[in-house]
């Protein structure tokens, strides 16, 4: 009765195809599985970027994984070869780990990598990336940055950069097509007669980075004797009305009378006949059923009504 | 296993120029960078360069009129090339491979006496 | 260029005790560029502890490291004979690389 074993998977490795962080994970079947032909050998995979507490795991019968990753940052990744307890007549056998490492040799001292980058999908519409050079680098350093997104055949450069001083110090994107809800990958290096320059990693997704523009057409209407409904309409653009959050400021008589979040085109408000002015203003972001983040869009032109009845009149901007 | 070892001449008269090989093992010189450092009684420890996985190099900007690092990625060597040496650099110059941002082994370093 | 400022120069300690040392950046540096290198004498340097708080292979539990910015220390939770060594911190962050002047500890 001797004990059933199998052997890990051959030519492990991961493999860069040049995403920007999309790297491939693969690897070939164990040697001898010559006595388990009537068998689906499975694979347990595990991977992560060094220094990440968690392993991620995948159970799969097939010879390849993908994934993304930070670059910036080493990746670890192991995978035996699991028998089902089908092929074994008992319980499942593993095999022992085999394991891989991937990282991009650096170059530079940290400090010539760009500082602050931010980067802003404005009104769901055109995303625009900007950062700070890194400390110490000279004015002949210039930084590239190339992207990438599942749906283009290879990383593209920026072709229309910000520049200050001669120096690359941001990116309008073009059109992206069919680009949100998946990883968006950046590379921004650089280069410079004096020293070499760190490349810098980014990814994120563009529906987590819309700053809506504001909302507009700003009106009052008297609902009752004591009761004024504020209404606005969403910002043209492609974001949908059921996209948004709303936060209203009120002032009534130069105090702020309240701030409030409403995920509606409108806002009823408590009022008295005392009050001699009322203003408000609103803001827009995309809300959680469209996204995960977003950032606040500035605040609308500001709409007021002033010493008269607002029964009889409904103002309009 | 990872092993790093420096060889360099020992004595060096004043104003002459300074030359240490730094011969590396286990593992690829097109896969890590190396770095120079120096540790003296009056200084401490020192960082003087590094040669880069991909051929480029850092220096520390106070002495980059007097270094030159080099490499030869088929032999497994960095070479350390000082020009001017004063009595200041009298030294144990040390060779370290890169890896994430540290230092993760060094050699066991080559005593340089510049003196007359 | 970033000063390294380590303290005490010198300390020493009783098997058992709890020993802690600092180190003190003349400008901020990123944790994850902030190390510790361990010598004995007539031998050199060992990577300690890395990016402030992650041990190198082979350094005993007893050992931890923490801080940000310009503010960083070392830890040993209960001394022992073969602590004794001079430590050094080190950034890696901005250029030049820069290097404590290390603490000395001695075993009392």
């Known amino acids: 009765d001797t004990e059933i074993k199998v052997n890990p998977p051959q030519d492990f490795e991961i493999v860069d195809p040049g995403y920007l962080g999309y790297l491939y994970l693969q690897w070939q079947p164990p040697l001898s599985l010559d006595h388990f032909k009537e068998c689906t050998v499975e694979y347990e995979l595990k991977y992560r970027n060094i220094g990440s507490e968690t392993w991620k795991t995948i159970i799969t019968k097939n010879l390849h994984y993908k994934d993304g990753f930070d670059l910036n940052k080493g990746i670890e990744a192991k995978i035996h070869t699991l028998l089902p307890w089908q092929c074994t007549n008992g319980s499942e056998v593993q095999s022992s780990w085999a394991e891989t490492t991937y990282w991009i040799s650096p170059q530079g001292i940290p400090e010539t990598k760009v500082q602050d980058m931010d980067c802003v999908y404005y009104n769901w519409q055109y995303l625009l990336c900007s950062w700070k050079p890194g400390i110490g680098v000279l004015l002949d350093t210039n930084y590239n940055l190339f992207y990438w997104y599942e749906g283009l055949d290879h990383a593209l450069q920026c072709v229309d950069y910000i520049k200050a001083d001669g120096q690359n110090i941001g990116c309008r994107f073009p059109y992206l097509e069919a680009s949100d809800y998946k990883d968006f990958y950046i590379c921004v290096n650089g280069s410079s007669e004096n020293k070499p320059i760190r490349s810098s990693y980014f990814t994120f997704q563009l529906q987590n980075i819309v700053k809506p523009l504001p909302p507009v057409y700003l009106t009052f209407t008297r609902e009752s004797s004591c009761e004024i409904k504020l209404k606005w309409s969403i910002p043209l653009g492609p974001i949908p009305a059921r996209c948004f959050d709303y936060e209203i400021e009120i002032r009534e008589d130069d105090t702020t009378l309240v701030t409030a979040t409403v995920e509606n085109e409108t806002y009823t408000l408590k009022t008295t006949n005392e009050t001699r002015q009322l203003c408000f203003v609103v803001r827009s972001k995309v809300n959680i059923y469209c996204s995960d983040d977003g950032i606040w869009s500035e605040w609308s032109d500001k709409q007021c009504w002033e010493g008269e009845d607002l029964s009889k009149k409904t103002l309009l901007r | 296993q990872v092993q790093l070892k420096e060889s360099g001449p020992g004595l060096v008269a004043p104003s002459q120029s300074l030359s240490i090989n730094c011969t590396v093992s286990?593992?690829?010189?097109?896969?890590?960078?190396v770095h120079w450092i120096r540790q003296s009684p009056g200084k401490g420890l020192e960082w003087l360069g590094v040669?880069?996985?991909?051929?480029?190099?850092d220096y520390n900007s106070a002495l980059m009129s007097r270094l030159t690092i080099s490499k030869d990625n088929n032999k497994s060597q960095v070479f350390l090339k000082m020009n001017s040496l004063q009595s200041d650099d009298s030294a144990m110059y040390y060779c370290?491979?890169?890896?994430?941002?540290?230092?993760?082994?060094w050699g066991q370093g080559t005593s340089v006496t510049v003196s007359s | 260029q970033v000063v390294l400022t380590q303290s005490p120069a010198i300390m020493s300690a009783s098997p058992g005790e709890r020993v802690t040392m600092t180190c003190t950046a003349s400008?901020?540096?990123?944790?994850?560029?902030l190390h510790w290198y361990h010598q004995k004498p007539g031998s050199s340097p060992k990577l300690w502890i890395y990016?402030?708080?992650n041990l190198a292979s082979g350094v005993p539990a007893r050992f931890s490291g923490s801080g940000s910015g310009t503010s960083y220390s070392l830890t040993i939770s209960s001394m022992e004979a073969e602590d004794a060594a001079t430590y050094y911190c080190?950034?890696?962050?901005?250029?030049?690389?820069?290097f404590g002047s290390g603490t000395k500890l001695e075993l009392k």
């Open positions: 370290a491979r890169d890896h994430r941002d540290a230092m993760d082994y």
């Open positions: 286990g593992f690829s010189l097109t896969k890590y960078g």
């Open positions: 040669k880069w996985a991909g051929g480029s190099t």
């Open positions: 400008l901020s540096v990123s944790s994850t560029y």
């Open positions: 990016s402030t708080s």
């Open positions: 080190h950034q890696y962050h901005r250029s030049p690389l820069t």
